[in-house]
């Protein structure tokens, strides 16, 4: 007896973080024997969507012409072959930005910092939120969460970095969110350029170098040391 059908591959184009109102296409790739593809969304009635395969039958396209809150969430896909349904794909998390007004990102005491010193990035929202995310451009794993304990609402989150080295330099943005949906984020803050000076022994990497998809030095800025701030927020690294 044959084993279970191999699980399909699920991905989104142009990516899995989509601004409100923009289009996104979800692709599910199975095998040439696929007769039908099914997409399920976590915590929603199933099936979320069904599509016939595109020739040569090894994948299907699920189109979202205009991103809204309804489409944000965690998806899996399956395909049906003559011998039955496949295993589910690995999950795809589709995140929508633009659900809330943009926060403000600032650096204390200054965005110009000397190597070896300390700096704190401060993300502030106009309305109270319970999750804040810091994004560093071109980082392999760019998300750092600060989530409040017990659902307490905060107007700001602090991201301390100490001691600062040259790899902390770069462009940052932050987002805010409510805990009831981790898939709905605010508009991004305006970018903040953190400039690290006075480091000869630790030169900054060339800005034109290719981005690695594996963990590496570019991840280090998002792992600040020090205790969790007194704001009641708990730190999560992803």
């Amino acid at each position: 007896q044959a084993g279970p059908l191999p699980k399909p591959t699920l991905w989104a184009e142009p990516g899995s973080v989509i601004s409100w109102g923009n289009s996104v296409t979800i692709w599910c790739q199975g095998t040439l024997e696929a007769r039908e593809y099914r997409l399920d969304k976590e915590e929603s009635p199933a099936p979320w969507d069904r599509q016939n395969p595109l020739e040569p039958k090894n994948k299907a396209r699920f189109s979202i012409p205009s991103m809204t809150e309804d489409y944000a969430g965690r998806y899996r896909c399956y395909y049906r072959s003559p011998v039955g349904w496949s295993q589910p794909s690995d999950p795809l998390e589709l995140v929508m930005t633009g659900a809330y007004s943009k926060p403000t990102l600032s650096a204390l005491p200054s965005p110009l910092v000397t190597s070896g010193k300390s700096v704190t990035l401060l993300c502030q929202s106009r309305s109270p939120m319970d999750t804040f995310l810091l994004i560093k451009e071109r980082a392999a794993h760019p998300l750092l969460h600060l989530r409040s304990e017990h659902g307490a609402q905060q107007h700001q989150a602090e991201f301390p970095m100490s001691p600062v080295t040259s790899v902390h330099g770069g462009t940052y943005r932050c987002f805010s969110s409510h805990g009831f949906s981790h898939y709905l984020l605010s508009h991004p803050s305006d970018p903040l350029e953190l400039i690290v000076s006075g480091s000869l022994e630790d030169p900054r990497p060339s800005p034109t170098r290719s981005v690695s998809t594996a963990a590496g030095p570019e991840d280090q800025p998002l792992m600040p040391t020090g205790s969790v701030p007194h704001s009641g927020l708990r730190r999560h690294w992803e």
Partner: nanobody, 121 residues
Framework: EVQLVESGGGLVQAGGSLRLSCAAS????????MGWYRQSPGHQRELVAA???????KIGDSVKGRFTISRDNAKNTVYLQMNSLKVEDTAVYYC???????????????WGQGTQVTVSS
């Protein structure tokens, strides 16, 4: 061939209850979200409730706490239990089937003929 057949509509007093049924062909019932829409004169068609093959449900805001939806897999039938009915619940109720994303777009793949529910004061 009629693939969705509704029953159970009628006239009821405000505060009363009704249970609508929708029988579907096995091929449709086993692979689709089943749900109910309603439409009253001068109003757009509104999603009342839906239930997936995974048992998860979506209930419209205007009927939350009063209406429940369930599906009987052995009978290929979906039920809408309507309690504490109000005059404003008066409408033609349509059974529908399709992928859930089609319900969000108000365009399920299959529709019944509709059954009239009238709530009097």
């Amino acid at each position: 061939e009629v693939q969705l057949v509704e029953s159970g509509g009628g006239l009821v007093q405000a505060g009363g209850s009704l249970r609508l049924s929708c029988a579907a062909s096995e091929s449709i019932f086993s692979s689709n979200v089943m749900g109910w829409y309603r439409q009253s004169p001068g109003h757009q068609r509104e999603l009342v409730a839906a239930v997936g093959i995974n048992g998860l449900t979506k209930i419209g805001d205007s009927v939350k706490g009063r209406f429940t939806i369930s599906r009987d897999n052995a009978k290929n039938t979906v039920y809408l239990q309507m309690n504490s009915l109000k005059v404003e619940d008066t409408a033609v109720y349509y059974c529908a089937a399709g992928a859930y994303v089609r319900f969000l777009q108000n365009s399920p793949d299959y529709w019944g003929q509709g059954t009239q529910v009238t709530v009097s004061s």
